[in-house]
């Protein structure tokens, strides 16, 4: 499989962004590239978001996504919105080179986003 | 239109050698990780060997039943991928196919290795 | 190592049934999965990569699913030139890219 790399930990805003950089080492010629953020917790996977771009055009998710992106060259910065602290956990980059043939597909180690709820405003009496 | 030609296939006593070739056409040789997968008489496929290509360092890995005894080559130049196998067993009797990644396949060719 | 179990390993089915076959993997792989297609007498073909996507020239009545450790491939309606024997493949590093024991797939 492809390498695929990506920092091991990111702390989420107080706002419950988190952002992080997915970088691959392509083989070939790659013109159709996908990307997907899968999260692991125990043994269960969840595909986060997905997208598929042509290499020297933007990364567009779904208009419901809770992910944004751009892309250069072999790197993908990804972000994460609406992220509470339950969601806290493993979230790993998988990279798949789509067209043209041969297909490649690489896995990153994941990074482990650490997401705290900001605590909420004491009453004020003023 | 691809191609994928393996040739070097034969009749060879055990603890003997053999190499054998694959010659590609048709599509982007040096962008494929090179494969060679074997097939025994009416059994399944088994993986054997895999040679990447430039910007991976043309690293190279075996399965534990041929490590030691095969070896994967591949010329870029000549599109063509190798695997010399010494040692040779009656167990490594099989078609052996060469792959472009895993999207291509060749005819295969036979090996029997036989006293 | 991570091992590829296929069931059932042979099935027999009539024209225009559905058919499913699956291939369990002893660890999470991540959709990184392959099925291929071997004709009596013919090399394999790869018809799913990735799991779920088709590989050109193969018809659209065999598609791929799953993910995790579980992958099923679906033939929609069977074919009399579905005849063949299918395989799964683990593609995900580290080696060896283990194949599954194969799927021989008859018709009634």
């Known amino acids: 499989a492809m390498h695929v790399a990506q920092p091991a930990v990111v702390l989420a805003s107080s706002r419950g962004i988190a952002s992080f950089v997915c970088e691959y080492a392509s083989p070939g010629k790659a013109t159709e590239v996908r990307v997907t953020v899968l999260r692991q917790a125990d043994s269960q996977v969840t595909e986060v978001c997905a997208a598929t771009y042509m290499m020297g055009n933007e990364l567009t998710f779904l208009d419901d996504s809770i992910c944004t992106g751009t892309s250069s060259g072999n790197q993908v910065n990804l972000t994460i919105q609406g992220l509470r602290a339950m969601d806290t956990g493993l979230y790993i980059c998988k990279v798949e080179l789509m067209y043209p043939p041969p297909y490649y597909l690489g896995i990153g180690n994941g990074t482990q986003i650490y997401v705290i709820d900001p605590e909420p405003c004491p009453d004020s009496d003023f | 239109e691809v191609q994928l030609v393996e040739s070097g296939g034969g009749l060879v006593q055990p603890g003997r050698s053999l190499r054998l070739s694959c010659t590609a056409s048709g599509f982007t040789f040096s962008d494929n990780w090179m494969n060679w997968v074997r097939q025994a008489p009416g059994k399944g496929l088994e993986w054997v060997a895999q040679?990447?290509?430039?910007?991976?360092?043309?690293?190279?890995y075996y399965s534990d039943s041929v490590k030691g005894r095969f070896t994967i080559s591949r010329d870029d130049s000549k599109s063509i991928a190798y695997l010399q196998m010494n040692s040779l067993k009656t167990e490594d009797t099989a078609v052996y196919y060469c792959t472009g990644g895993m999207d291509y396949w060749g005819q295969g060719t036979t090996v029997t290795v036989s006293s | 190592d991570i091992q590829m179990t296929q069931s059932p390993s042979s099935l027999s089915a009539s024209v225009g049934d559905r058919v499913t076959i699956t291939c369990g993997a002893s660890e999470i792989i991540y959709g990184a999965l392959n099925w291929y297609q071997q004709k009596p007498g013919k090399s394999p073909k790869l018809l799913i990569y990735?799991?779920?996507n088709l590989a050109d020239g193969m018809p659209s009545r065999f598609s791929g699913s799953g993910s995790g450790r579980d992958y099923t491939l679906t033939i929609s309606s069977l074919q009399p030139e579905d005849v063949a024997t299918y395989y799964c493949?683990?593609?995900?590093?580290?080696?060896?890219?283990?194949f599954g024991g194969g799927t021989k797939v008859e018709i009634k």
């Open positions: 040679i990447r290509n430039k910007p991976y360092n043309y690293e190279t």
């Open positions: 990735g799991a779920t």
């Open positions: 493949q683990k593609i995900l590093s580290p080696p060896p890219w283990t």
